[in-house]
């Protein structure tokens, strides 16, 4: 199901980050350091519960949840928010809440690669990862 | 709980330098960064720049681009700001303080340096 | 740099009396990344409310924050003594970081 993801990927390109980062409503100095760093994506599946763990010297984090069920996350950004991850077509589509807002992180696989889309509101942000 | 210590006043001779220290405790200091923050007698907050102990990336406000340098020694959990050609124009209480990620506000602030620049 | 103005300057409030303080920017920033401080003479500055209206923590509900854009504000239901200080907006939008130049706040 999620096994296409499993594995360690690190960033290779990123467009639009700074801009995803100000529609979301990072501060200045946050998005600075967070658009600097070049982290390692670390995906693993156990039974029916996925791990996505993200490494950099910005700031290491860890989710890990079952597809379909609203879990609470503090985000590399620092935002509590609430998470929801399903697959759809092949994607896994992840949507977070937070302070009335609301933001939609896509990973999916083309080719060899790890795509992830991240979309606020009329922003988009593509971030292309690699098997490390 | 979240404590920056900041040693209480500093007294130096016009054209000498200065390394103000911040001492961070009860939380991972690598996980936010370091702002300072000038204050003149009387007068209002200005904004010197920020470090992010965890990767050593500075920005500095382009007002004190050569005035102030920020380290930091991730061993000892502490925060430096070294103040160059120090004039009269130098002398206020400079604070440090801990940015909490996403909003950037400064969410704990240390007691702060009263520095005297006088002959 | 965005240049942020409060008004009024300086001004005097009776207990129980409804205060505003207002922030008015100089370019439109994210509601997310303007802050409030609260400063007393010969004190550290405190962080008051974050993110326009986020009251931080042990600040009485008295205490409220609004605005979006360029526009925002700083209220105070009913005065009490122990809000007489100094008060600060700051916006984290866009560098440099920059603040207001303060309101002070006197008890009538």
């Known amino acids: 199901m999620c096994d296409a993801f499993v594995g360690t990927w690190k960033l290779v390109s990123s467009e639009n980050f700074d801009d995803y980062m100000k529609e979301v409503g990072v501060g200045f100095a946050t998005r600075k350091v967070a658009g600097m760093a070049k982290p390692n994506m670390i995906i693993s599946v156990n039974g029916d519960l996925v791990t996505i763990r993200s490494e950099s010297t910005f700031k290491n984090t860890e989710i890990s949840f079952k597809l379909g069920v609203e879990f609470d996350e503090i985000t590399a950004d620092d935002r509590k928010v609430k998470s929801i991850i399903t697959l759809d077509g092949g994607a896994l589509v992840q949507v977070q809440k937070w302070d009335g807002k609301s933001t939609t992180i896509k990973r999916k696989r083309d080719g060899d690669k790890l795509v992830v889309e991240c979309v606020m509101k009329g922003v988009t942000s593509t971030r292309v990862y690699e098997r490390a | 709980q979240v404590q920056l210590q900041q040693p209480g006043a500093e007294l130096v001779k016009p054209g000498a330098s200065v390394k103000l220290s911040c001492k961070a405790s009860?939380?991972?200091?690598?996980?936010?960064?370091i702002t300072w923050v000038k204050q003149r007698p009387g007068q209002g907050l200005e904004w010197i720049g920020d470090?992010?102990?965890?990767?050593?990336?500075?920005t500095n406000n382009e007002k004190f681009k050569s005035k102030a340098t920020l380290t930091v020694d991730t061993s000892s959990s502490t925060a430096y700001m070294q103040l160059s050609s120090l004039t009269s124009e130098d002398s206020a209480v400079y604070y440090c303080?801990?940015?909490?990620?996403?909003?950037?506000?400064?969410?704990?602030w240390g007691q702060g340096t009263t520095l005297t620049v006088s002959s | 740099e965005v240049v942020l103005t409060q008004s009024p300057a300086l001004m005097a409030a009776s207990p129980g009396e409804k205060v505003t303080i207002t922030c008015s920017v100089s370019?439109?920033?994210?509601?997310?990344?303007l802050h409030w401080y609260q400063q007393k003479s010969e004190t550290s500055p405190k962080p008051w409310i974050y993110?326009?209206?986020n009251l931080a923590s042990g600040v009485p509900v008295r205490f409220s924050g609004s605005g979006s854009g360029t526009s925002y504000s700083l209220t105070i239901s009913s005065m009490e003594a122990e809000d007489a200080a100094t008060y600060y907006c700051?916006?984290?939008?866009?560098?440099?970081?920059?603040f207001g130049a303060g309101t002070k706040l006197e008890l009538k």
């Open positions: 009860g939380y991972t200091f690598t996980s936010n960064a």
């Open positions: 370019s439109s920033i994210s509601s997310s990344n």
């Open positions: 470090i992010s102990p965890g990767s050593g990336s500075t």
């Open positions: 303080a801990r940015l909490r990620g996403y909003y950037d506000y400064f969410d704990f």
């Open positions: 700051q916006q984290a939008s866009h560098y440099p970081l920059t």
């Open positions: 993110g326009t209206s």
